[in-house]
């Protein structure tokens, strides 16, 4: 956030940039948390825009019995590996076809016995506040579906009738990793020393990191005709004086008519 300065006072302004602001010859360049001519004001809203999508990765092992292991399968650039990858990917795409969060599979290792396939199942969902529940549900469905297919698609008399057959007992889920996104934590961190006063509020399922000085939210502080200003002790209303009134009180809601104090015939000198 920048504020431009014109005229003779500029050099004087330069040495007075506050809160880590730097002078660029024309104006104070303020760090993210501040604005104003001297970077003296604390912003009332911090952009913590979530990622568009959140990902999860499940580390799985299945044993494919309809392909016999050969040494070439260890080499990821071999024709054998590429053909195996093609069939395995097609098979898994069919298995997980009913899961909207399913993105694909990534084979990490093939090893002997018949072919033990260490692989990742990749999941992705649009960010919403409920993303953890959505991905948790998706991982449960993945477990159900892979268990079902490795139980049903099995060799009979050393022959497979399906695209791939599996060893029922060779299916394992090793690990599940979900990309962590914690808007409350991000908000607190980015607000630094003002972290106690910034909160996350949702609008159209999007998180906003705001202080009570930001209007239009449930936590917004109503300063009436005054100005909300953030300090290390929290948000405060700076009350204004108009031609006719003085305003006071915590929310500047108490107006005192000047004429009642000075009398009707007070003269300005």
């Amino acid at each position: 956030r920048t504020t431009t300065c014109f005229g003779d006072g500029c050099q004087n302004t330069a040495s007075r940039c506050k809160n880590g602001g730097t002078w660029d010859g024309l104006k104070c360049q303020c760090p993210n948390l501040y604005y104003g001519e001297l970077c003296e004001e604390v912003v009332s809203s911090i952009d913590i825009g979530p990622p568009e999508t959140i990902s999860a990765q499940m580390e799985l092992t299945v044993t494919v019995t309809s392909v016999k292991f050969t040494e070439e399968l260890k080499n990821h650039s071999s024709q054998e590996f590429q053909e195996f990858k093609q069939t395995f990917t097609e098979q898994m795409n069919i298995v997980y076809s009913g899961i909207p969060e399913y993105v694909g599979v990534n084979i990490t290792k093939l090893r002997l016995g018949s072919v033990v396939v260490e692989h990742d199942v990749l999941l992705r969902t649009k960010y919403t506040p409920e993303y953890k529940t959505v991905l948790d549900n998706a991982t449960e469905v993945v477990k159900e579906k892979i268990t079902k297919v490795t139980t049903q698609q099995i060799m009979i008399n050393d022959i497979c009738s399906d695209m791939m057959c599996f060893n029922t007992t060779g299916t394992q889920v090793q690990n599940i990793t979900v990309t962590q996104y914690d808007p409350e934590e991000d908000c607190r961190k980015m607000a630094k020393e003002y972290g106690d006063y910034f909160v996350v509020e949702y609008r159209d399922q999007k998180p906003y990191c705001i202080s009570p000085c930001e209007p239009g939210f449930s936590v917004s502080k109503n300063c009436n005709l005054g100005k909300c200003q953030m300090s290390l002790s929290g948000p405060q209303c700076l009350c204004v004086t108009t031609e006719t009134h003085w305003y006071s009180g915590e929310t500047c809601n108490q107006g005192t008519q000047k004429s009642l104090v000075y009398g009707h015939h007070h003269h300005h000198h």
């Epitope: 309809s66 392909v67 016999k68 050969t70 195996f84 069939t87 060799m155 022959i159 009738s161």
Partner: nanobody
Framework: EVQLVESGGGVVQPGGSLRLSCAAS????????WGWFRQAPGKEREAVAL???????FYADSVKGRFTISQDNSKNTLYLQMNSLRAEDTAVYYC?????????????????WGQGTMVTVSS
């Protein structure tokens, strides 16, 4: 790039014989799996006879004792000797291959295919 070209199809009377050939290029017969599949009009493609580099062979129940799969590694050619042909053997016959040592009858697991050769058994 793997190329498979079938030949030897034709019209034959019931009880007659035919020998199908599949010439392969870009591929070594000493590895992987080879097979013959067929597809009759209005039906799904089905495995007829399969062979793998580890010596495993498979024959569909309907052709056992009548058909024989073999290969000539020096010529990189796969064969299907068909004897005692019946009307129900009428179909387009396809040669298939994979560098993987397969144990599956499902055509979706086979990566390389020829264009097919027609076999008609009719009196």
């Amino acid at each position: 790039e793997v190329q498979l070209v079938e030949s030897g199809g034709g019209v034959v009377q019931p009880g007659g014989s035919l020998r199908l050939s599949c010439a392969a290029s870009g591929f070594t017969f000493s590895r992987g799996s080879w097979g013959w599949f067929r597809q009759a009009p209005g039906k799904e493609r089905e495995a007829v006879a399969l062979i793998s580099s580890d010596g495993w062979t498979f024959y569909a129940d309907s052709v056992k004792g009548r058909f024989t799969i073999s290969q000539d590694n020096s010529k990189n050619t796969l064969y299907l000797q068909m004897n005692s042909l019946r009307a129900e053997d009428t179909a387009v016959y396809y040669c298939a291959a994979s560098v993987l040592v397969l144990r599956t009858l499902n055509p979706k697991a086979w990566h390389h295919w020829g264009q097919g050769t027609m076999v008609t058994v009719s009196s």
